[in-house]
Amino acid sequence: LSCHFPRRPAYGDVTVTSLHPGGSARFHCATGYQLKGARHLTCLNATQPFWDSKEPVCIAACGGVIRNATTGRIVSPGFPGNYSNNLTCHWLLEAPEGQRLHLHFEKVSLAEDDDRLIIRNGDNVEAPPVYDSYEVEYLPIEGLLSSGKHFFVELSTDSSGAAAGMALRYEAFQQGHCYEPFVKYGNFSSSTPTYPVGTTVEFSCDPGYTLEQGSIIIECVDPHDPQWNETEPACRAVCSGEITDSAGVVLSPNWPEPYGRGQDCIWGVHVEEDKRIMLDIRVLRIGPGDVLTFYDGDDLTARVLGQYSGPRSHFKLFTSMADVTIQFQSDPGTSVLGYQQGFVIHFFEVPRNDTCPELPEIPNGWKSPSQPELVHGTVVTYQCYPGYQVVGSSVLMCQWDLTWSEDLPSCQRVTSCHDPGDVEHSRRLISSPKFPVGATVQYICDQGFVLMGSSILTCHDRQAGSPKWSDRAPKCLLEQLKPCHGLSAPENGARSPEKQLHPAGATIHFSCAPGYVLKGQASIKCVPGHPSHWSDPPPICRAASLDGFYNSRSLDVAKAPAASSTLDAAH
């Protein structure tokens, strides 16, 4: 018997030493989120072991004090969803002794009314502001530096309107050092980990993003007042570009933020002359008045491969040559302002001759072609590593027109457990119909049945392999039936067996002494039930007539069937 697997908090994680009594579960939250509830649970011993407290949750708190702030993040309540109305949140950031703080603006999105963000250079509400959303239209791209070891952050929202709120990154830095840089949608490498004077940092962007403003390489300069010699760059999905890589990504302008209205963007993608291009359109969520066009060539006069408006699910296009031109025109009148509205296009260079285009490897899986040359009739089978499952068709065939019969599949992490099934003589309560990680199934036996095993199963993730139930499904066994009390032997007779208690299903046999005749049933049964009871009243032994006595000597013991075995309780 064990405790159920504790639920992983949203925006956090849990590590479990053991699910058996004495085992513990430790919870922690992602940066910017705080644990509400016990950080540490212990599995207590009982008939059904249980955790000594409820699982905690991770919340983006409305304010708080962060002492010894080194690097981290503060987010508004509800982030990345919208904040709620009528909030007044205060955060106090305090760097370790002798250090200062730098703030990066990861995201600030306030409703256009009386919602306000103020950042003060000090440790209280009276400290001078260094940023006030009322006063400043644009965010300072270089961020903010504290003069001492404190920043005081205020977020206030009124009773109308809501938006995504804010995410701020903070970094403490020592005397004689620069602060840790940050680039959204990108990465950086540093020559030294603590950023003393002389450190150089090189930035790069995620696929589909372009470095803008600032420099690719920056250096920590000035021993008297260490600072970066250039502004950190920004990575943005830009409108238009010429790409000559063999594989890459084209993103809608500003992705994943909404694209602007009235845009006309053109991207040219060029691969090696004897190759062609596979376009894998993974996300297409644009407005009905927006148009995305693919041209099979290097300008807008080329043949149109496809033209799309509105949303559309994952699809692929193949060019007939080594160039493709992608044009995106957004409606000048209306705009689709949702987060992750736009498009994500992955492109790959593929061979062009008498074979189907080369199929890429898929993450978390592998492919096996039926022959090395991808000629007509070749079959490619995709399989996934343990813990992943094929989404789409696992078998692709090279067709007469040298296209593949199906879209490229993917290997998706198996994020749910199999249905543990019904248990006979019980009902079950399900927290989520598709049994995702964290889902629970509770079994409750029908009346008259007893649970053997674990009442609650929890679906939990495993490092390797598919998610697994915390226990196997229980059984509901017929509860032990009470025995029947022994009946006394009739006068001038006997009973067999001579026990005081007879289990449900057992049979008792009666006989009479010589010269007596049995009146009633020679054998009676203990009928299972609540309570168990005898099938008939006990018989009596009546004196026989003298003639009868001599003539019926053979009847003085009633013939009885063999005693039946007790009922099988586990039916």
Epitope: L429, S431, V441, Q447, G448, E479
Partner: antibody, heavy 120, light 106 residues
């Protein structure tokens, strides 16, 4: 003292949805499953389903799957039942009920009932 | 699901009279529970686990039975006993109720 306080009567149009509530007091809400029972004009009683407020798990009578949805709001110790695509067959009194103990099989505590009338 | 048939559907009894009503199950059940309901009120748990009386239920009420046949008996009818009585089982899910026996005062 265990009390189950249900929301007031509802008059609905066919095809609409209705959501009724049952506020529990006098015991720890998350320690007991909450059951819902229908009593139609012919007076017969039918078990709709139950919800475990602690884990949010639900179990339904096959007959009411797709018709009823059970939810809870732990912090206010309130259980809810939503009925969708209402027809005249759904006109009835709906009770929330609790068993005496976690391991008992009879309904010891009942709400006062919510009368739902479906009429064009 | 198990069907419970209550009989009679309606009966009347004079004060002091002995009353017996029955509940027959379509399959064997382990226990039977009984509820009393008066017009315009919620059902009340009246007998549980076949024969046990909750506090507040008069001792003139008793329950018995096993397998498919169960009964509720009032040893001596009183005016306040006039109500509808429902039987209920949960030996098999879903739990089911009988259609009720309406007991009237003569």
């Amino acid at each position: 003292e265990v009390q189950l306080q249900q929301s007031g009567p509802e008059v609905m149009k066919p095809g609409a949805s209705v959501k009724m509530s049952c506020k529990a007091s006098g015991y720890t809400f998350t320690d007991y499953n909450m059951h819902w029972v229908k009593q139609n004009q012919g007076k017969s009683l039918e078990w709709i389903g139950e919800i475990n407020p602690n884990i949010g798990g639900t179990g339904y009578n096959q007959k009411f799957k797709g018709k009823a949805t059970l939810t809870v709001h732990k912090s206010s110790s309130t259980a809810y039942m939503e009925l969708r695509s209402l027809t005249s067959e759904d006109s009835a009194v709906y009770y929330c009920a609790r068993t005496y103990s976690y391991y008992s099989y009879e309904f010891a505590y009942w709400g006062q009932g919510t009368l739902v009338t479906v009429s064009a | 699901q198990i069907v419970l048939t209550q009989s009679p559907a309606i009966m009347s009894a004079s004060p002091g009279e002995k009353v017996t009503m029955t509940c027959s199950a379509s399959s064997s059940v382990s226990y039977m529970h009984w509820y009393q309901q008066k017009s315009g009120t919620s059902p009340k748990r009246w007998i549980y686990d076949t024969s046990k009386l909750p506090s507040g239920v008069p001792a003139r009420f008793s329950g018995s039975g096993s397998g498919t046949s169960y009964s509720l008996t009032i040893s001596s009818m009183e005016a306040e006993d006039a109500a509808t009585y429902y039987c209920q089982q949960w030996s098999s899910t879903p739990p089911t109720f009988g259609a009720g026996t309406k007991l009237e005062l003569k």
